[in-house]
C-alpha cells in the first residue's frame, strides 16, 4: 500500500500546528517533566515490514487523535488551533486505515504486531494517568504537548524510512 | 541542511550596545526554541536565554536578565540578541544555538559565533 | 544555579586507550525517569557538537566510542577506544532546572 505523497506533508503541518498550540514556556514547567516511556523500539523501523509498521503508526496517531479529541482537552487549548490539529490526525487516520485494510485483505496476520500495537496503548496509559494526577494542570499539558510533539516526529522519520523502501 | 548564521565581528565602545543576528535555514524557525550562549576566550561556556520564535516566549538566565535582550523576526528566519551598556566583561564570542529535542533542552545545531570585542 | 564540576580540568590518553570524564552535579538533575545532563565536545576554532544527551542517549552521527552514564548528581564521559581527532574540550551542561549551566570542560589530549 502505498501512502498519498501528501501523506508527510500532513505529518510535518501536524506538528506545526502542535508547536503553535504551546501556551505557556516549557521552561516554566521543568519540574513537571516525566519519561512517559515512548516505546522506541517499535518505531525503529529496521526489524520489521511495511505492514506491521503501518498498523502500528496507525494506532499511535489514533491514540494521539484520542487525546486530544477528549472534553479535558478542548478546556486546554486554543479552540481553532485545537480543531485544525484534529482535523489533520484525522485526515492521517483516513490514509492509514485505509493501507491497514489493504494489508489485511492481501493477508498479512495482525498478530505479528499485536505486541508492538499493546507497548503503544501501555504508553498512552501513561500519559493519561499522568494527566489525571496532574490534575490537566497547565504544565501536564505542556509536558504532554512536547512528549507528544517527540513521538510524532519519530513516527514522521518511520514514516519516510518507509516511503523510500518502496 | 539546518544552518544557523550567525553576524560578523562587531567592535563597540564601554557604555555602548550591540545587536546581533542570528539568520536560521534549514528547519521550521518558528517550531524550535532558540539559546543564546556566551563563551569568553579561553574559557567555558555560559547560558543567557532562550526564545521561541513562534510566539517571542523568553526566558532568560537572572545573571543575564538586565544585559541581554532576545528577539525574533519570523518573516525573515532571523533571531537577535541584542547586549546593552557593554563593558569588557562582555567581550566574548556569543552562540545561537537550536533547541534539541522540545523539553530536553539541549542544543544540536550551532552558528559559527559572533565575535564582540569592547574597548575604548 | 545548579554548579557543574568537572574533572579532572585535563587528561592525556594514549591511542586506544579509555578516556573517562566526570561531571558532578551540586544538585540533582535527574526527575521522574530522566537525567538532564548532556555532553558537548568543542575542538579548537570551532563550535561545541553534541555527543550524549540524557546522560546516556548517543546523538545521530556521533561514534560508538562515545558513551555516557549516571544519574542524579553524578555523571561520566567515556571514549573508548581513543583517537586523534577526539583531541578537544568536553563539556557537561544540564537542564534540570533555570539557569542551565555548563561545566568548565576538560581538555583531552592525545599522547
Known amino acids: 500500500c502505498d501512502l498519498p505523497e501528501t501523506h508527510s506533508l500532513d505529518n510535518r503541518r501536524t506538528l506545526m500546528l502542535l508547536a503553535q498550540m504551546s501556551r505557556i514556556s516549557p521552561s516554566s514547567c521543568l519540574m513537571d517533566r516525566h519519561d512517559f516511556g515512548f516505546p522506541q523500539e517499535e518505531f525503529d523501523g529496521n526489524q520489521f515490514q511495511k505492514a506491521p509498521a503501518i498498523s502500528v503508526l496507525h494506532e499511535l496517531i489514533q491514540q494521539i487523535f484520542n487525546l486530544f479529541t477528549t472534553k479535558d482537552s478542548s478546556a486546554a487549548w486554543d479552540e481553532d488551533l485545537l480543531d485544525k490539529f484534529c482535523t489533520e490526525l484525522y485526515q492521517q487516520l483516513n490514509d492509514l486505515e485505509a493501507c491497514v485494510m489493504q494489508e489485511e485483505r492481501v493477508g498479512e496476520t495482525p498478530l505479528m504486531n499485536a505486541d508492538s500495537i499493546l507497548a503503544v496503548k501501555k504508553y498512552f496509559r501513561r500519559i493519561t494517568l499522568y494527566l489525571t494526577e496532574k490534575k490537566y494542570s497547565p504544565c501536564a499539558w505542556e509536558v504532554v504537548r512536547a512528549e507528544i510533539m517527540r513521538s510524532l516526529s519519530l513516527s514522521t522519520n518511520l514514516q519516510e524510512r518507509l516511503r523510500r523502501k518502496e | 541542511q539546518v544552518q544557523l548564521q550567525e553576524s560578523g565581528t562587531v567592535l563597540a565602545r564601554p557604555g555602548a550596545s550591540v545587536k546581533m543576528s542570528c539568520k536560521a535555514s534549514?528547519?521550521?524557525?518558528?517550531?524550535?526554541?532558540m539559546h543564546w550562549v556566551k563563551q569568553r576566550p579561553g574559557q567555558g561556556l555560559e547560558w543567557i536565554g532562550v526564545?521561541?520564535?513562534?510566539?517571542?516566549?523568553?526566558t532568560y538566565n537572572q545573571k543575564f536578565k538586565d544585559k541581554a535582550k532576545l528577539t525574533a523576526v519570523t518573516s525573515a528566519n532571523t533571531a537577535y540578541m541584542e547586549l546593552s551598556s557593554l563593558t569588557n566583561e562582555d567581550s566574548a564570542v556569543y552562540f545561537c544555538?537550536?533547541?534539541?529535542?522540545?523539553?530536553?533542552?539541549?542544543?544540536?545545531?550551532w552558528g559559527q559565533g559572533t565575535t564582540v570585542t569592547v574597548s575604548s | 544555579d545548579i554548579v557543574l564540576t568537572q574533572s579532572p580540568a585535563s587528561l592525556a590518553v594514549s591511542l586506544g586507550q579509555r578516556a573517562t570524564i566526570s561531571c558532578r552535579a551540586s544538585k540533582s538533575v535527574s526527575t521522574s525517569g530522566h537525567s538532564y545532563m548532556h555532553w558537548y565536545q568543542q575542538k579548537p576554532g570551532q563550535t561545541p557538537k553534541l555527543l550524549i544527551y540524557l546522560a546516556s542517549n548517543l546523538e545521530s552521527g556521533v561514534p560508538a566510542r562515545f558513551s555516557g552514564s549516571g544519574s542524579g548528581t553524578d555523571f561520566t564521559l567515556n571514549i573508548h577506544p581513543v583517537e586523534e581527532e577526539d583531541a578537544a574540550t568536553y563539556y557537561c551542561?544540564?537542564?534540570?532546572?533555570?539557569?542551565?549551566?555548563f561545566g568548565s570542560g576538560t581538555k583531552l589530549e592525545i599522547k
Open positions: 551542561q544540564h537542564s534540570g532546572e533555570l539557569p542551565f549551566t
Open positions: 544555538t537550536r533547541n534539541y529535542k522540545y523539553d530536553y533542552y539541549t542544543m544540536d545545531y
Open positions: 534549514g528547519y521550521s524557525f518558528t517550531t524550535y526554541w
Open positions: 526564545i521561541y520564535p513562534g510566539n517571542g516566549d523568553t
